[in-house]
């Protein structure tokens, strides 16, 4: 029995921890009965052959965040009981081919964040019990065929952030038990057909942040157990029909940050378990009817930061469970009155940063549970009578940064806003843009003696022609000096009184959700 090395701490003798920059060589002697050894944040640069000979009971060895650059071939000799080995966050460039031959009972091997430039085909040949292999953050430019062939028990493999540009279609062919495969942050430009065919138990496939331009139509057809598929931040410009057809268990799909221009009807489905679909930051210009009709369990649909100028009236058919719909930061000028008709469970809709000039009075007709509507930074001059009357749960309505035209036609909206001011939040109220006589005044607290909707006379010098000369048709001209008589049967009725919402995010979408 050895005592604890002076530079280490030993709890119950079997757990040894050695940390600190003052350690420049492997501490010794180590307690013979040590079962867990952690060597962290030291300046150790080398691992000689004989340092673990007397601690054969060791189960877990964690040598992380050191300066380790060189490991002798026999360094792990006599560690037949070792189950968990981490050499992450060191400076390893190469590993001796036979380095792991005596630790053939390993279950986890963590080699992330080193400088490994290659893996020998025989490097992992004895690891039939290995469950997890982490190679994230190295410099592996390619993966040789056969390198994983003996890892038949592997369930988790991380090859992210290495910089390789292509994969052999046979590299994963013996990994039938693999559940998590992470290939993100590489430079893959295309993935050969068949690459994932052997991965029948795969649950997570992470391909985000590569340079993938096209997807083979049958690429995922053998991955019927896939639950999470990350394809974001690639160069995908087209989704082949049927690409997601064999994924009945998929519940999360990210496609944001690609170059998608269109979505063909039926491309998403059937995926009865999909809960979230992230499509923001693409180049989508329009949505056809039934674009998402097979996604009847979808709860979150993020389409912000695209170039949408047209949404077909039936684009959202079938999305009966949708809760969050993000359409902000697009080029929408008009919306069909039925576009949200099937979204009976919608709670939050974000339409800000578009070019909406008007909204149909029926746009929210069937969406009775709406809690937040974001309409700020659009081109709205007025809103139809009664557009929000039935929305008893509405808590947050953003209307600022629109060029509201405060003539007599605005009175019903003005009255409704007064009665429902709490719903506008406490930060910013809508303000009149025209006519010039009331510009800058709050639409909520402005005097009710609005000018009529007659054609305007000369404006003050500040006014450009762009926002202010587009007057309403002069069908009900009222002298601008006439006091407007309010009718008592305006369609803007009072809603249930609610307390002001102080926290803007209480009912709003998170930044992540809104894209």
């Amino acid at each position: 029995y050895y005592g604890c090395p002076s530079e280490c701490t030993c709890s119950r003798a079997s757990q040894v921890e050695c940390t600190g920059a003052q350690i420049v060589a492997m501490p010794s002697p180590l307690p013979w009965n040590a079962m867990s050894l952690q060597i962290l944040n030291t300046h150790i640069t080398e691992l000689p052959e004989d340092k673990f000979l007397n601690i054969s009971a060791l189960i877990a060895l964690k040598m992380e965040k050191n300066e380790l650059a060189n490991i002798m071939p026999g360094a792990f000799r006599n560690l037949g009981s070792l189950r968990h080995l981490s050499l992450a966050n060191n400076k390893l460039k190469n590993l001796p081919v036979r380095l792991f031959q005596d630790v053939n009972n390993l279950e986890t091997l963590l080699l992330s964040n080193n400088q490994l430039v290659q893996i020998q085909p025989a490097q992992f040949s004895q690891f039939s019990n290995l469950k997890e292999l982490q190679l994230y953050g190295n410099n592996l430019e390619y993966i040789p065929e056969g390198v994983f062939d003996h890892l038949v028990g592997l369930t988790k493999l991380n090859l992210g952030n290495n910089g390789f540009t292509h994969l052999s279609p046979r590299v994963f062919q013996h990994l039938g038990n693999l559940q998590v495969l992470r290939l993100y942050e590489n430079r893959l430009s295309d993935i050969p057909m068949g690459t994932f065919d052997a991965l029948g138990n795969l649950q997570e496939l992470a391909l985000q942040e590569n340079q993938i331009g096209t997807l083979s139509p049958g690429l995922f057809h053998n991955n019927r157990n896939l639950q999470r598929l990350y394809l974001s931040n690639n160069h995908i410009s087209h989704l082949p029909p049927g690409i997601f057809m064999q994924l009945p268990h998929l519940n999360k799909l990210t496609l944001f940050g690609n170059s998608l221009k269109e979505l063909s009807p039926g491309v998403f489905g059937p995926m009865p378990n999909l809960r979230e679909l992230w499509l923001y930051n693409n180049h989508i210009t329009s949505l056809p009817d039934n674009a998402f009709s097979h996604l009847n369990q979808l709860q979150v649909l993020i389409l912000s930061h695209n170039q949408l100028s047209y949404i077909s009236p039936g684009a959202f058919n079938g999305l009966t469970n949708l809760r969050e719909l993000s359409l902000h930061t697009n080029a929408l000028q008009d919306l069909d009155g039925n576009v949200f008709r099937s979204l009976a469970n919608l709670r939050n809709v974000s339409l800000q940063n578009n070019r909406l000039r008007q909204l149909p009075g029926s746009i929210f007709a069937n969406v009775n549970g709406l809690m937040t509507i974001q309409l700020q930074n659009n081109n709205l001059e007025n809103l139809p009578l009664g557009i929000f009357d039935h929305l008893g749960n509405l808590c947050e309505l953003r209307l600022y940064d629109n060029p509201w035209r405060c003539d007599s036609n605005i009175l019903p909206l003005h009255d409704w806003l007064i009665l429902n001011r709490a719903r506008l939040g406490t930060d910013t109220l809508p303000v009149c843009s025209s006519p010039a006589s009331v510009r800058g005044q709050s639409l909520v607290i402005i005097n009710v003696n609005f000018p009529g909707p007659s054609v305007q006379g000369p404006e003050t010098p500040e006014v450009s022609s762009y926002p202010d000369t587009s007057s309403y048709p002069d069908s009900t001209s009222i002298s601008s000096t006439t006091e407007i008589t309010r009718s008592t049967d305006d369609d803007y009725t009072d809603l249930n009184t609610i307390e002001p919402i102080d926290d803007r995010n209480t009912w709003g979408m998170t930044d992540a959700q809104s894209g």
Epitope: H283, T285, H305, Q307, S309, T329, A331, Q333, Q352, N353, R355, Q376, N377, N378, N379, Y400, D401, N402, P403, D427, T428, V431, C432, S433, R439, G440, P461, E462, S464, S465, Y466, P467
Partner: antibody, heavy 121, light 107 residues
């Protein structure tokens, strides 16, 4: 009449910071979006950033995202551009411009005369 | 979105009809404006929404087009029109200018 007066330009080393200001007068400042547009010496126009009338919406060109911040003080009728981690390619005359409406559109009916930012070691 | 103006420069005489084109790499509906800039001066808005004449701009200037192809026409070139002309799209962030077309006096 509408006036826009930029200030805050000058010589700065790469990696340095500057804060540009644009004092506005002659119009209801809070009811118009405002933008910054730059022009490198002898080159064309390059849109930099826009902010809506309330300041609630801001957008940037890709090359300045994370380095520049547009803001406005509607009580002081002033537009700002905070520029950090400046690079040689940021060298340009910076114009502030008034949009024709409160929401963010790229149609600017009044411009300042510009302030020169030089990034050089 | 990339905007490509043509020609990059042209020479014309007073009274000439001048046409400048702006082509966008993606469809932008009519979200395009035209600006005029003279040396040492700030730009001036001429046309917005592809074809609407800005207040105070002479009627000899006109704009047309939609989708990806846009045109600025000066029906009868005047001495004060010699300048550089830029198109700008604001359909999609980041907004982008064309590279400019310089209209010079023909010698």
């Amino acid at each position: 009449q509408v006036q826009l007066l930029e200030s805050g330009g000058g010589l700065v080393q790469p990696g340095g910071s500057l804060r540009l200001s644009c004092a506005a007068s002659g119009f209801t400042f809070s009811t118009f979006a405002m933008s910054w547009v730059r022009q490198a010496p002898g080159k064309g126009l390059d849109w930099v950033s826009v902010i809506s009338g309330t300041g609630g919406s801001t957008f940037y060109t890709d090359s300045v995202k994370g380095r520049f911040t547009i803001s406005r003080d509607n009580s002081e009728n002033t537009l700002y551009l905070e520029m950090n981690s400046l690079r040689a390619e940021d060298t340009a005359v910076y114009f502030c411009a008034k949009a024709v409406t409160v929401n963010t559109r790229g149609f600017f009916d009044y411009w300042g005369q510009g302030t020169l930012v030089t990034v050089s070691s | 979105i990339v905007l490509t103006q043509s020609p990059s420069s042209l020479s014309a005489s007073v009274g000439d009809r001048v046409t400048i084109t702006c082509r966008t790499s993606q469809v932008i509906r009519n979200d395009l404006g035209w600006y005029q800039q003279k040396p040492g001066k700030a730009p001036k808005l001429l046309i917005y929404d592809a074809s609407s004449l800005q207040s105070g701009v002479p009627s000899r200037f006109s704009g047309s087009g939609s989708g990806t192809d846009f045109t600025l026409t000066i029906s009868s070139l005047q001495p004060e029109d010699f300048a550089t002309y830029y198109c700008l799209q604001d359909n999609n962030y980041p907004w982008t200018f064309g590279q400019g077309t310089k209209v010079a006096i023909k010698r």
